[in-house]
């Protein structure tokens, strides 16, 4: 593959570049729909950053569904997005970084962050809770990682992104785990706990991928995400089995998930603590 021989291109398994999606639907989870047909289709997986096969039921579902691998790649990958971009090239910011701050029309007055193209910095603003635009981040770190330039004019994040149901913005979620481990379970096991915005206090469990355990949290009764289980057993069954230990570049073995304490990028902790 001639692309791999290009000067300054670094291929790495453990650190991925910021994911800049060409279409927001590329961030949707594979949705087989309610029907029962067995049709081979392809979807873009935001966590592996590759187009992958899935079985489609034949009706409904979403736009992250393609007849062929080629079509999927064409719609959702930009110059092999799973590679670290050449260090000689500056990565483009997503278009939404250049939108003005937009509080929307609601009055929730939630603290959010936006990229100010005048000052070239991420700044705090008050978001109302509805409408607005995609230049809207839950943390300063997220905003910086997506929209600010690093010291050399490069963008510096190591985040994947996923579509956030809050305001449909592409919101980064750190999916890094210590490099000895790879996650092969459902992608939502890597998302932070999200209690939603209703007023109930239901006991639920979510998978904390930083510590590798299922933990309780209070669910509000609506909204949130799929990292939400009614029992610890269900949570463990869905998420715990997903960790695989890499023993060499070529081979993978399943492992019991006992780990030494390791330093993990703090931004992830901040995201899930904020949502608890």
């Amino acid at each position: 593959d001639s692309e791999e021989d290009e000067e300054h291109t670094i291929i790495t398994d453990t650190e991925l570049p910021p994911l800049k999606l060409m279409h927001s639907f590329c961030a949707f989870k594979a949705d087989d729909g309610p029907c029962k047909a067995i049709m081979k289709r392809f979807f873009f997986n935001i966590f592996t950053r590759q187009c992958e096969e899935f079985i489609y039921g034949g009706c409904e579902g979403n736009q992250n569904r393609f007849e062929s691998l080629e079509e999927c790649k064409k719609m959702c990958t930009r110059d092999n997005a799973n590679r670290i971009i050449k260090t000689t090239l500056q990565q483009e910011k997503p278009d939404f970084c250049f939108l003005e701050e937009d509080p929307g029309i609601c009055r929730g007055y939630i603290t959010r962050y936006f990229y100010n193209n005048q000052t070239k910095q991420c700044e705090r603003f008050k978001y109302g809770g509805c409408l607005g635009n995609m230049n809207n981040f839950e943390t300063l770190e997220e905003c910086k990682n997506i929209c600010e330039d690093g010291p050399n004019g490069f963008q510096v994040d190591n985040y994947g992104t996923q579509l956030n149901a809050v305001n449909n913005s592409l919101t980064p979620q750190s999916t890094k785990v210590p490099s000895l481990f790879e996650f092969h379970g459902p992608s939502w096991c890597l998302t932070p706990a999200d209690r939603g915005l209703c007023r109930a206090n239901e006991n639920r469990f979510y998978y904390n991928s930083v510590i590798g355990k299922c933990r309780p949290f209070k669910y509000s009764g609506c909204g949130g995400n799929e990292n939400n289980f009614t029992s610890k057993q269900e949570c463990l069954r869905a998420c715990k089995k997903g960790f695989i230990q890499r023993i060499s570049k070529g081979g993978l073995i399943k492992t019991k998930r006992k780990r030494k304490k390791q330093r993990v990028k703090i931004a992830y902790e901040e995201i899930f603590v904020k949502n608890m």
Epitope: F25, I105, G108, G129
Partner: antibody, heavy 124, light 107 residues
Framework: QVQLQQSGPGLVKPSQTLSLTCAIS??????????WSWIRQSPGRGLEWLGM?????????DYAVSVKSRITINPDTSKNQFSLQLNSVTPEDTAVYYC??????????????WGQGTLVTVSS | DIQMTQSPSSLSASVGDRVTITCRAS??????LSWYQQKPGKAPKLLIY???NLQSGVPSRFSGSGSGTDFTLTISSLQPEDFAVYYC?????????FGQGTKVEIK
């Protein structure tokens, strides 16, 4: 009790301008917890949001792409009302037009109040 | 634009039946989802706002639930006055969009 009262002609000629007014009682057009909207309904199109205005330290508006080049929604603070102007109408614009309040007094928004509706027919 | 797809488009039911209408958004929305009832010649009437909150004065047989892309309006025991057209609405993303409606008819 908040009410919206619509007024305006029911018949407009093609290529002319459709003008409707919505008078608000019991709330203020300058409220910072509402947006004021126009919505229309026709058998072919169902319910279609046309646009809205809202005041948040300054006046803002948002319009549906389908009518953006032809629509103006204006507030009239002295009369506590807002108006719809739709230029260059065609028979396709024949519909029941509703003014409505979008309640935005919290984390989520919803239309909680509607005018009585005005059937506007575009015909020569 | 977010497309709101309601199903079924019409249904026949009897007084006392439990009726469920679903609304599927083409992409995830947050909590700005509401439900309306419309009778011939009248403006729509708000039933449920913020996914699951009952509007003041609306009978408790109406309830709403859901999250993400899938939302449901349930009438626990259909009454004669409930025969009408029902719409969902999202005010989470511009443009504001409605479902195409579900007509509830007498069996």
């Amino acid at each position: 009790q908040v009410q919206l009262q619509q007024s305006g002609p029911g018949l407009v000629k093609p290529s002319q301008t459709l003008s409707l007014t919505c008078a608000i009682s019991g709330d203020s057009v300058s409220s910072n917890s509402a947006a004021w909207s126009w919505i229309r309904q026709s058998p072919g199109r169902g319910l279609e949001w046309l646009g809205m205005i809202f005041y948040r330290s300054k006046w803002n508006n948002d319009y549906a792409v389908s009518v953006k080049s032809r629509i103006t929604i204006n507030p009239d603070t002295s009369k506590n009302q807002f108006s719809l102007q739709l230029n260059s109408v065609t028979p396709e614009d024949t519909a029941v037009y509703y003014c409505a309040r979008v309640n935005a007094n919290g984390y989520y928004a919803y239309v909680d109040l509607w005018g009585q509706g005005t059937l506007v027919t575009v015909s020569s | 634009d977010i497309q709101m797809t309601q199903s079924p488009s019409s249904l026949s039911a009897s007084v006392g039946d439990r009726v469920t209408i679903t609304c599927r958004a083409s992409q995830p929305i947050y909590n700005s989802l509401s439900w309306y009832q419309q009778k011939p010649g009248k403006a729509p009437k708000l039933l449920i706002y913020g996914v699951s909150n009952l509007q003041s004065g609306v009978p408790s047989r109406f309830s709403g639930s859901g999250s993400g892309t899938d939302f449901t309006l349930t009438i626990s025991s259909l009454q004669p006055e409930d025969f009408a057209v029902y719409y969902c609405l999202q005010v989470d993303n511009l443009p504001i969009t409605f479902g195409q409606g579900t007509k509830v008819e007498i069996k």
